[in-house]
């Protein structure tokens, strides 16, 4: 079964600043991701950003900066202020959809004891949710 | 491992319907879109759509678009296929695949009067 | 929607020769291309995907190659189970399309 990793990371030079990055580990050609946030996608979780290789990226509050990294991985930088802003616990979700195998999603949040600005490898997530 | 088992060959006339079926084992698609490919007797394969079981979005070849409707039902895990006022060249082999890894047996139509 | 043209559309080989098959893009796929395997019973299994990633539990004398357009299946040494009918699917637009096959025959 295709894998889906998550990593997330909170910025050592803003501390309620984060970057999740997502990436997909199986066949086929990326045709959407969907990154939320508070659970997966359509299950109680919010959209914090979808991206489109073709139609574009969009992304909402506190989504400062959704970008692909690679055909397969993408990252996400969310704005460290105000009400909406993410905490230690939150956990964020990122779904792919590859043409024609079908979706897989994962979800991730900072490592507990995690020091800001330093992240491990991304490895496949501990969360594989299979739609 | 997504096992897929297909409806057994079914004979039937000009004009008719008919709608094969596609069960997934272990009762989940695990993520799979479910897609249908049409082989002709002793040609090459075409790519019929696919459906997305998790929402039941399709997408359609277009050459399709009215000839195939394609469904879900999540509870039995079973993906449908139904071909609409068929004629002889619909005989064929019906695969359907999860994604492109997992392939079922093939379901034989005859249409013949 | 992209043509793929396969070549050629029956092979003899002896076993343990080696062996490629190929694929014509009409347009680009970057690497957006599969490789199957269909039995005489009409059994269907992939054994590449994205040009060159081999499929698990699939025999390390298949592999997938790239140059330009055109994309070839390898068979470093043929085996008795081989001679069957292979065929290319490219995904890189809707609808997929397939090569109209090889038939790979003993001699």
């Known amino acids: 079964t295709p894998e889906v990793w998550v990593q997330v990371r909170m910025e050592a030079t803003e501390l309620s600043s984060f970057t999740i990055r997502c990436g997909f580990l199986g066949s086929g050609s990326i045709s959407l991701v969907t990154v939320s946030w508070g659970g997966p996608n359509g299950a109680g979780g919010t959209t914090l950003a979808v991206l489109h290789p073709e139609r574009g990226i969009r992304q909402w509050a506190p989504a400062r900066q959704a970008r692909w990294e690679t055909q397969s991985s993408i990252s996400l930088i969310l704005e460290g202020s105000g009400a909406s802003s993410p905490c230690a616990n939150t956990t964020f979700c990122c779904k792919f959809a590859s043409f024609p195998e079908g979706s897989w999603e994962a979800c991730g949040s900072l490592p507990p004891s995690s020091d800001p600005g330093l992240s491990a490898p991304p490895t496949p997530a501990p969360i594989l949710r299979a739609d | 491992e997504v096992q897929l088992q297909q409806s057994g060959p079914v004979l039937v006339k000009p004009g008719a319907s008919v709608k094969m079926s596609c069960k997934a084992s272990?009762?989940?698609?695990?993520?799979?879109?479910i897609n249908w490919v049409k082989q002709s007797h002793g040609k090459s394969l075409e790519w019929i759509g696919l459906?997305?079981?998790?929402?039941?979005?399709?997408n359609y070849n277009q050459k399709f678009k009215d000839k195939a409707t394609l469904t879900v039902d999540k509870s039995s895990t079973t993906a449908y296929m139904e071909f609409n006022t068929l004629t002889s060249e619909d005989s064929s082999v019906y695969y359907c695949?999860?994604?492109?890894?997992?392939w079922g047996q093939g379901t034989t139509l005859t249409v013949s009067s | 929607d992209i043509q793929m043209t396969q070549s050629p559309s029956s092979l003899s080989a002896s076993l343990g020769e080696r062996v490629s098959l190929t694929c014509r893009a009409s347009?680009?796929?970057?690497?957006?291309l599969n490789w199957l395997q269909q039995e005489p019973d009409g059994t269907i299994k992939r054994l590449i995907y994205?040009?060159?990633s081999l499929d698990s539990g699939v025999p390390k004398r298949f592999s997938g190659s790239r140059s330009g357009s055109d994309y070839s299946l390898t068979i470093s040494s043929l085996e008795s189970e081989d001679f069957v009918d292979y065929y290319c699917?490219?995904?890189?637009?809707?609808?997929?399309?397939f090569g109209g096959g090889t038939k790979l025959e003993i001699k």
């Open positions: 695949a999860g994604g492109t890894v997992y």
């Open positions: 272990g009762n989940t698609f695990n993520g799979y879109y």
């Open positions: 459906i997305d079981p998790s929402n039941g979005g399709t």
């Open positions: 347009q680009d796929i970057g690497n957006n």
């Open positions: 994205a040009t060159s």
């Open positions: 699917l490219q995904y890189a637009s809707s609808p997929p399309t």
